[in-house]
């Protein structure tokens, strides 16, 4: 038997993936555990194998279909269970009635690119990945720029309160190396959270023009 506190958290990427993390304070040596997904009205179910991510937590991804297929909607409820093998039997360790569109976490934005760069400004664009058509334009973004000598944690957050897949960074220093990241969040969902940050995009501003002798 397993004692201790259990925490079971899952997010839906809005298309065909539910990612889950299960943490359990009690020791679970060499035990095989799975997450089982049973939708309330769909003719499919899915299972994934929980793999250790730390001493007391395990994670897995329920792959529901091809990456851009819309496998669940706001009408669905999915019963998610953590099942662990005990000898020849399976024991239920955790259960939740999961409302996918109340628990959203999108994929990180992709395809970041510099559209135009000058001495003091840089225009950057990106794309969202595997985001449901149900959101239409109801998305927001956060962005941050890493300046020389600073950390990501120190970078001020810029908020875009609409579906805008570009930004014009101003007041940059000429001939300086920067990095840029962006993340996305749907407006829908009580427990919805920000996507992971995108892969950083490195860029360099143009050098200032040399002054002419008079």
């Amino acid at each position: 038997a397993v004692n201790g506190t259990s925490r079971f958290t899952c997010f839906y990427n809005s298309r065909a993936n539910i990612s889950c993390v299960w943490s359990q304070d009690g020791a679970l040596q060499d035990t095989s555990c799975q997450v089982h997904a049973w939708p309330d009205r769909r003719r499919w179910n899915q299972t994934c194998e929980l793999l250790p991510v730390s001493q007391a937590s395990w994670a897995c991804n329920l792959i529901l279909g091809t990456p851009d297929s819309q496998k669940l909607t706001a009408v669905d409820i999915v019963t998610l269970r953590v099942m662990c093998r005990e000898g020849v039997r399976w024991r239920m360790m955790a259960i939740q009635d999961f409302k996918p569109f109340e628990n959203l976490r999108l994929m990180a934005p992709i395809s970041l690119q510099v559209v135009h760069v000058e001495t003091h400004r840089c225009n950057i664009s990106w794309k969202i990945s595997q985001a449901s058509h149900y959101f239409e334009r109801h998305l927001e973004f956060e962005a941050r720029t890493l300046s020389p000598g600073h950390t990501w944690e120190e970078a001020p957050l810029m908020t875009l309160k609409q579906k805008q897949e570009w930004i014009c960074l101003e007041t940059l220093t000429p001939d300086t190396q920067y990095e840029f990241q962006v993340r996305v969040k749907p407006l829908q969902g009580e427990f919805t959270t920000w996507s992971p940050w995108s892969q950083p995009l490195a860029f360099r501003t143009k050098p200032a023009a040399l002054g002419k002798d008079t």
Epitope: D40, R41, T73
Partner: antibody, heavy 116, light 107 residues
């Protein structure tokens, strides 16, 4: 095999209420949403609402909000749909149907006639 | 509400014909579309769910396709028992809605 058996035809006066029953068998009653759909004479299908017998969760078509009540009795695997303040345009065949994939199994229908 | 517009509203065909009925959703509904067959005085019968999946027991001459807003039900070779009314249905978002129906008659 899965079966949904509905109560018999009803004739009601305007302003009255009608309660239609739907008895399910052949599957785990608590697990699947039961839908109510109606069809006026010579017309198409209209969704009224749904109930999940296990939890009692309900979703209505706003068109019927305040007039339709859906309940269930898990001991007899029966769901009920009550429609109040009846008017002549509520004359229709009322169907219960299970939602699994789509609306996969249907009751035989209950004819409700509203006439003064 | 999502409108489901079916066409044609009626259709005359002969046994052995290939018949196509289309349904257009007023908004993107992914693949959450079903097709039903109804004969006079009877309850609808489920044919297709998730736009293209046939229920067990449904003959292979019935097929569904489409995603987003445009959907099709095809009967590859009409049989005498196929003359009926056909409805499309979206269950992507509340309230669930149906097409107005296509009446398939013998020519």
């Amino acid at each position: 095999q899965v079966q949904l058996v509905q109560s018999g035809a009803e004739v009601k006066k305007p302003g009255a209420s009608v309660k239609v029953s739907c008895k399910a068998s052949g599957y785990t009653f608590s697990r699947y949403w039961i839908q109510w759909v109606r069809q006026a004479p010579g017309q198409g299908l209209e969704w009224m609402g749904e109930i999940l017998p296990g939890s009692g969760s309900i979703n209505h078509n706003e068109k019927f909000q305040g007039r339709v009540t859906m309940t269930r009795d898990t001991s007899t695997s029966t769901v009920y749909m009550e429609l109040s303040s009846l008017r002549s345009e509520d004359t229709a065949v009322y169907y219960c149907t299970r939602h699994y994939g789509s609306f996969d199994y249907w009751g035989q229908g209950t004819t409700v006639t509203v006439s003064s | 509400d999502i409108q489901m517009t079916q066409s044609p509203s009626s259709l005359s065909a002969s046994v052995g014909d290939r018949v196509t009925i289309t349904c257009k959703a007023s908004q993107n509904v992914g693949t959450d579309v079903a097709w039903y067959q109804q004969k006079p005085g009877k309850a609808p019968k489920s044919l297709i769910y998730s736009a293209s999946y046939r229920y067990s027991g449904v003959p292979s001459r019935f097929s569904g396709s489409g995603s987003g807003t445009d959907f099709t039900l095809t009967i590859s070779s009409l049989q005498p028992e196929d003359f009926a009314t056909y409805f499309c249905h979206q269950y992507s978002s509340y309230p669930f809605t149906f097409g107005q129906g296509t009446k398939l008659e013998i020519k």
